[in-house]
């Protein structure tokens, strides 16, 4: 079980307690109810870039 406050997942993915594995955040627009999508919303996606220096 995943320890609180830690994330073993690479950028662009998030831990699913329902599946006990990292899941791709790219699937969240299609199915936002998934438990791991909360973790995806907490951090910008891998391709996110600031619009200022």
């Amino acid at each position: 079980e995943q320890a609180p406050g830690t994330s073993p997942c690479s950028s662009g993915s998030s831990w699913s307690a329902d599946l006990d594995k990292c899941m791709d955040c790219a699937s969240c627009p299609a199915r936002p109810h998934s438990d791991f999508c909360l973790g995806c919303a907490a951090a910008p996606p891998a391709h996110f870039r600031l619009l200022w220096p």
Epitope: E1, A17, D18, L19, D20, R31, H33, S34, D35
Partner: antibody
Framework: EVQLLESGGGLVQPGGSLRLSCAAS????????MIWVRQAPGKGLEWVSY????????HYADSVKGRFTISRDNSKNTLYLQMNSLRAEDTAVYYC?????????????WGQGTLVTVSS | DIQMTQSPSSLSASVGDRVTITCRAS??????LNWYQQKPGKAPKLLIY???SLQSGVPSRFSGSGSGTDFTLTISSLQPEDFATYYC??????????FGQGTKVEIK
């Protein structure tokens, strides 16, 4: 060959308890999410409960929340459903089923079912 | 909760007939729709997953289509062993899944 074998059903009085078991064989049990589904006599299928592969995450239908508890023992390849405060409307055949291997989108193997009858 | 409504509730058909069963969701579920077959006294059997993917070992006369709210299960040429009850199931809100009420396919 993948097999799921339920047991523990029977006749129980309203307010009573039962513990159902689902013994898995023919596959590695621990990576798979599992569910219980029930079917009242002559009726359709109703999802009851879900448990994650490790057992750390569980979910319940509103109709059983607070009365039923799902659990699993991966060392024994067994899924359980503890049913308390049983009501007449809980009378049904109870099936365990295995979730798909990438997500829990579908349920590819089911047990034969065990009948629970709640009656005085 | 997402409600799944199947139609018809029952139908009579003959061996060799083409049979179509529809399933409608109360809101869009994308393609997260599965179909099961159940015979009396037996457990459900997965036929189609994710709207159109045929489960391994299921005859090719079974096919599924649709997306959003409207889905179809088609049996291209009904065989004697196909007389059963068919259920759709949405997994858009997994693990909180819901089933349709079932469609019973009977012999005419």
């Amino acid at each position: 060959e993948v097999q799921l074998l339920e047991s523990g059903g029977g006749l129980v009085q309203p307010g009573g308890s039962l513990r159902l078991s689902c013994a898995a064989s023919g596959f590695t049990f621990s990576p798979y999410p599992m569910i219980w589904v029930r079917q009242a006599p002559g009726k359709g299928l109703e999802w009851v409960s879900y448990i994650s592969p490790s057992g750390g995450s569980t979910h319940y239908a509103d109709s059983v929340k607070g009365r039923f508890t799902i659990s699993r023992d991966n060392s024994k390849n067994t899924l359980y459903l503890q049913m308390n405060s049983l009501r007449a409307e809980d009378t049904a055949v109870y099936y365990c089923a295995r979730g798909g291997d990438t997500y829990f989108d579908y349920f590819d193997y089911w047990g034969q079912g065990t009948l629970v009858t709640v009656s005085s | 909760d997402i409600q799944m409504t199947q139609s018809p509730s029952s139908l009579s058909a003959s061996v060799g007939d083409r049979v179509t069963i529809t399933c409608r969701a109360s809101q869009s579920i994308s393609g997260y729709l599965n179909w099961y077959q159940q015979k009396p006294g037996k457990a459900p059997k997965l036929l189609i997953y994710q709207a159109s993917s045929l489960q391994s070992g299921v005859p090719s006369r079974f096919s599924g289509s649709g997306s959003g709210t409207d889905f179809t299960l088609t049996i291209s040429s009904l065989q004697p062993e196909d007389f059963a009850t068919y259920y759709c199931q949405q997994s858009y809100t997994s693990p909180f899944i819901t089933f349709g009420q079932g469609t019973k396919v009977e012999i005419k």
